[in-house]
């Protein structure tokens, strides 16, 4: 089945679908592109605003950090909080506000685009939605805490980053999260622009690798604001 | 060459269900996704919701959730959409296409192949 | 649940025209986009996947651009085949949307 060979490190480089190419003919991508898949809920809109359930920061805005909104609170329980300002006690890089990070549990200035840190774990995952059903299968990506003592290899059902080797992310895949590539040099990303302005993908893409920031791919900048293509691009 | 053949066309009334096929062939059926996708006589297309050929994993259109059931049936690579409590307005042509590499972790580019569609008529 | 905007719905042109249709999404969808040709009677076909790859076997008149929210199709020298109804579909989260649709026909 599927998941067991999720579970396994056999399959890598796919070649590309019916007819298509594996980058994509006139974009500076690599020959892995890192375009994923779709996904997600009913979401608040920004006019009706209420509080942004959420399974990550990668899921929030860029003003925001995922956790409970109660100190101590259910770990399950997890919605997108307003990021922290500088001098902010903090606990890892995405709480704190775009141009800072977390540095000895404080939000401190960074250069421009600092590396943002892992997709962050958290306890739990939420993997149904308001259009989803199992119909009568179970859950098949609840796992047991054994498969935790080694780190997940590529295309390993995981619940968090921390689960994975490095140089990789817990992200989404259709129904389950498995372990992804961090994003290279020249990649395609993705650039959660303002509050609410995003679904949940159920493809989705990790961040762009250490040193490196989502930037509007150079040759993008002629094109209207919301045209641009990002790309993990060196600091 | 990768293809999808519909059952034929059907006639029902208004409280019935229709259940329609479509039979993969030239691809491993298992290693993709199928789409739902309907249009009703001059309309544009509606997405009606996916099944994962590997283990049955939905997502419904919130519209038609609690009428509608994707299923497959790996040994005959066929996946099934059927529709229940029929009215008027479900008159269409439902079209099933080919729909995500679900061992494919770097890159998603949605429906590629369809099927000839299955024109259905609710009529009292 | 993500809106695609298309315009315009309906578009008359001649052989030789260079012909531009747009779909706008209510959200930011990265380029999960692709753009549909249908003609009456038969199944979408796929001109165009990840916004701006040409399937295979379509000939190199059509192309796509944009991503994030604002994507366009375009066809350089509109040939007799050509005239059709064109879709977009988004399907970066569920569920997936279709535009409305452009139908193009003779001038």
């Known amino acids: 089945t599927l998941n067991s060979v999720l579970n396994s490190n056999a399959i890598k480089n796919l070649p590309p679908p019916l007819g298509g190419a594996a980058g994509h003919p006139g974009s500076a991508v690599s020959a892995a592109p890192g375009i994923l898949y779709p996904g997600g809920n009913k979401y608040q809109t920004i006019d009706n605003y209420q509080p942004y359930p959420c399974a990550e920061d990668e899921e929030c805005g860029t003003d925001e950090y995922c956790a409970s909104p109660t100190r101590g609170g259910d770990a399950g329980v997890q919605i997108c909080l307003a990021c922290r300002k500088r001098r902010k006690r903090c606990m890892r890089h995405a709480m704190c506000c775009p141009g800072n990070y977390c540095k000895n549990g404080i939000c401190v200035s960074s250069d421009q685009n600092h590396f943002r840190g892992e997709i962050e774990e958290t306890i739990t995952e939420s993997f149904g939605n308001d259009h989803s059903t199992l119909d009568g299968y179970s859950r098949r990506t609840t796992l047991s805490s054994k498969m935790y003592h080694t780190k997940g290899q590529e295309g390993s059902v995981c619940l968090r980053s921390s689960d994975c080797a490095s140089g990789l992310c817990c992200a989404r895949h259709f129904w389950s999260k498995i372990c992804k590539p961090v994003l290279k040099e020249g990649q395609v990303c993705t650039k959660h622009r303002r509050k609410g302005s995003h679904g949940l993908e159920i493809f989705q893409r990790c961040y762009c690798g250490e040193g490196l920031s989502c930037r509007i791919q150079k040759d993008h900048h002629q094109a209207s604001n919301s045209s641009r293509l990002h790309t993990c691009q060196r600091h | 060459q990768v293809q999808l053949m519909q059952s034929g066309a059907e006639v029902k009334k208004p409280g019935a269900s229709v259940k329609v096929s479509c039979k993969a062939s030239?691809?491993?059926?298992?290693?993709?996704?199928i789409s739902w996708v309907r249009q009703a006589p001059g309309q544009g297309l509606e997405w009606m919701g996916w099944?994962?050929?590997?283990?049955?994993?939905?997502n419904y259109a919130q519209k038609l959730q609690g009428r509608v059931t994707m299923t497959t049936d790996t040994s005959t690579s066929t996946a099934y959409m059927e529709l229940r409590s029929l009215r008027s307005d479900d008159t269409a042509v439902y079209y099933c296409?080919?729909?995500?590499?679900?061992?494919?972790?770097?890159?998603?580019?949605?429906?590629?192949?369809w099927g000839q569609g299955t024109t259905v008529t609710v009529s009292s | 649940d993500i809106q695609m905007t298309q315009s315009p719905s309906s578009l008359s042109a001649s052989v030789g025209d260079r012909v531009t249709i747009t779909c706008r999404a209510s959200?930011?969808?990265?380029?999960?986009l692709g753009w549909f040709q249908q003609k009456p009677g038969k199944a979408p076909k796929r001109l165009i996947y990840?916004?701006?790859s040409l399937q295979s076997g379509v000939p190199s008149r059509f192309s796509g651009s944009g991503s994030g929210t604002e994507f366009t199709l375009t066809i350089s020298s509109l040939q007799p085949e050509d005239f059709a109804t064109y879709y977009c579909?988004?399907?970066?989260?569920?569920?997936?949307?279709f535009g409305q649709g452009t139908k193009l026909e003779f001038k």
């Open positions: 030239g691809y491993t059926f298992t290693s993709y996704g």
């Open positions: 990840a916004a701006s």
């Open positions: 099944i994962s050929a590997d283990n049955g994993h939905t």
């Open positions: 296409a080919r729909d995500g590499e679900l061992l494919n972790y770097y890159y998603y580019y949605g429906m590629d192949v």
């Open positions: 959200q930011g969808i990265r380029d999960d």
């Open positions: 579909l988004q399907h970066n989260s569920y569920p997936c949307s």
